[in-house]
């Protein structure tokens, strides 16, 4: 293990000033896999601090970060993928604070892309579309998808719909006439892995059409 | 050395309940969930659930839900299993074992036997 | 709930022969080459011991001549050679979903 009091009672007693999380990324460079990890407090003087992951790996006992910024960072195929990894904050050869981690449980997945929204004036509705690397994953390839919309004069009214396919149809009558709309789109694992939300994708904006006075249906753009 | 030790056997009526205490050492032990699996007599191995004692939260086995509560105390590195509305057929001996990740067992207690009798 | 089917339900071994043991689930406990399958062994009156994770990795402390193998629905665990103290039912168990299932277990005797 890690030097813990053998009695287990001492979980607490890492110091506090180092406490720091970790998500991993699975192919996310072809085969190979990325564990980023950070400090919680960002006025951690970084300077002569390391970050050590040992256990779950293949071939190796241990593997070392790469320092970037305020950001440590390993890229590697040598992920086991099953069973707890430990994760240490080293000065030199001491151990300041361990975790102990599954990777498949601190998946972040990557942003979903070229989200866009097409008008169907026959239908009276949106077509929302968008696409995801991880389609083309072998790992994490289940995705719960959270497509949110406001409408830009609203700065904190999002909607959000939670949805497992990349389409999504919104009906015009839900939505407000003549009005500009802002639609993003972000993806959590699903199935097995577990993990955070990936970053959102960029934002598409969009405007409904005006509504018709004669039949009260809305005007295509 | 990694230990989990679990308190001792129990007679029980129909209609009852069971608390098995299974109190872990030699690691840290916030770091490893804790399961439960039980065994019939001279049969297989079934999991009824399992516990995060770093956050406390549970999943349990449907065929067991409504009956079974799994609960830990840090301070005591020990955790509890109780089950509720027993019957001959939860005659059986309790594990408690660790999960070394999602979802094997690599340290085990030593078994509870659970007699459900009238 | 993954039903796992192990056979044989019972072998006889001479000591320094192999022994196999098959394991086959009703769905993939596999995702890519994380295969989510695990090995015990249990002598009477004991806990269960873990042998093998992840369907191959063996686990600290567990001689070599244990090892398995497989992938997707079909997972073999095999002993070469076998010595009288390997007497004891061996049990597959997946990981993939919950609820969490062992097969039925296979009792090894040594001639």
């Known amino acids: 293990e890690s030097g813990y009091a053998q009695n287990g009672d001492l979980e607490d007693a890492e110091l506090d000033d180092y406490s720091f999380s970790c998500y991993s990324q699975l192919e996310v460079n072809g085969s190979q896999h990325s564990l980023t990890c950070a400090f919680e407090d960002p006025d951690v003087n970084i300077t002569n601090l390391e970050f050590e992951i040992c256990g779950a790996l293949v071939e190796v006992k241990c593997l070392n970060f790469r320092k970037l910024q305020e950001i440590y960072f390993i890229e590697t195929k040598k992920f086991l993928l099953i069973g707890k990894s430990n994760i240490c904050v080293k000065v030199g050869e001491k151990s300041l604070t361990c975790k102990k981690i599954d990777l498949t449980t601190i998946v972040k997945p990557e942003a979903p892309f070229d989200l866009s929204v097409v008008y169907r004036e026959g239908a009276n509705d949106f077509v929302v579309t968008f696409n995801t690397s991880h389609l083309q994953k072998k790992y994490v390839k289940v995705l719960m998808h959270d497509v949110a919309y406001r409408q830009e004069k609203d700065e904190n009214k999002w909607t959000h719909v939670n949805l497992s396919s990349t389409k999504l149809t919104l009906l015009q009558r839900k939505l407000q006439p003549a009005a500009m709309y802002e639609i993003k789109v972000r993806s959590i694992p699903d199935h097995y892995f577990k993990g955070f939300w990936s970053e959102w994708s960029p934002s598409y904006y969009f405007r409904t059409p005006e509504i018709n006075n004669s039949s009260g249906e809305m005007d295509p753009i | 050395q990694v230990q989990l030790v679990q308190s001792g056997a129990e007679v029980k009526k129909p209609g009852a309940s069971v608390k098995v205490s299974c109190k872990a050492s030699?690691?840290?032990?916030?770091?490893?969930?804790l399961h439960w699996v039980r065994q019939a007599p001279g049969q297989g191995l079934e999991w009824m659930g399992g516990i995060d004692p770093k956050t406390g939260g549970t999943a349990y086995n449907q065929k067991f839900k409504g009956r079974v509560t799994m609960t830990s105390d840090r301070s005591t590195s020990t955790v509890y299993m109780e089950l509720s509305s027993l019957r001959s057929e939860d005659t059986a001996v309790y594990y408690c074992?660790?999960?070394?990740?999602?979802?094997?067992?690599?340290?085990w207690g030593q078994g509870t036997t659970v007699t459900v009798s009238s | 709930d993954i039903v796992l089917t192990q056979s044989p339900a019972s072998l006889a071994v001479s000591p320094g022969q192999r022994a196999t043991i098959t394991c086959r689930t009703s769905?993939?406990?596999?995702?890519?080459?994380?295969?989510?399958m695990h090995w015990y062994q249990q002598k009477p009156g004991q806990p269960p011991k873990l042998l093998i994770y992840?369907?191959?990795n063996l686990e600290s402390g567990v001689p070599a001549r244990f090892s398995g193998s497989g992938s997707g629905t079909d997972f073999t665990l095999t002993i070469n050679p076998v010595e009288a103290e390997d007497t004891a039912n061996y049990y597959c168990?997946?990981?993939?979903?919950?609820?969490?299932?062992f097969g039925g277990g296979t009792k090894v005797e040594i001639k």
């Open positions: 168990q997946q990981s993939i979903k919950d609820p969490y299932t």
């Open positions: 769905e993939s406990v596999s995702i890519h080459l994380l295969h989510l």
């Open positions: 074992a660790r999960s070394g990740g999602r979802w094997y067992f690599d340290v």
């Open positions: 992840g369907a191959s």
């Open positions: 030699g690691y840290r032990f916030t770091d490893y969930e």
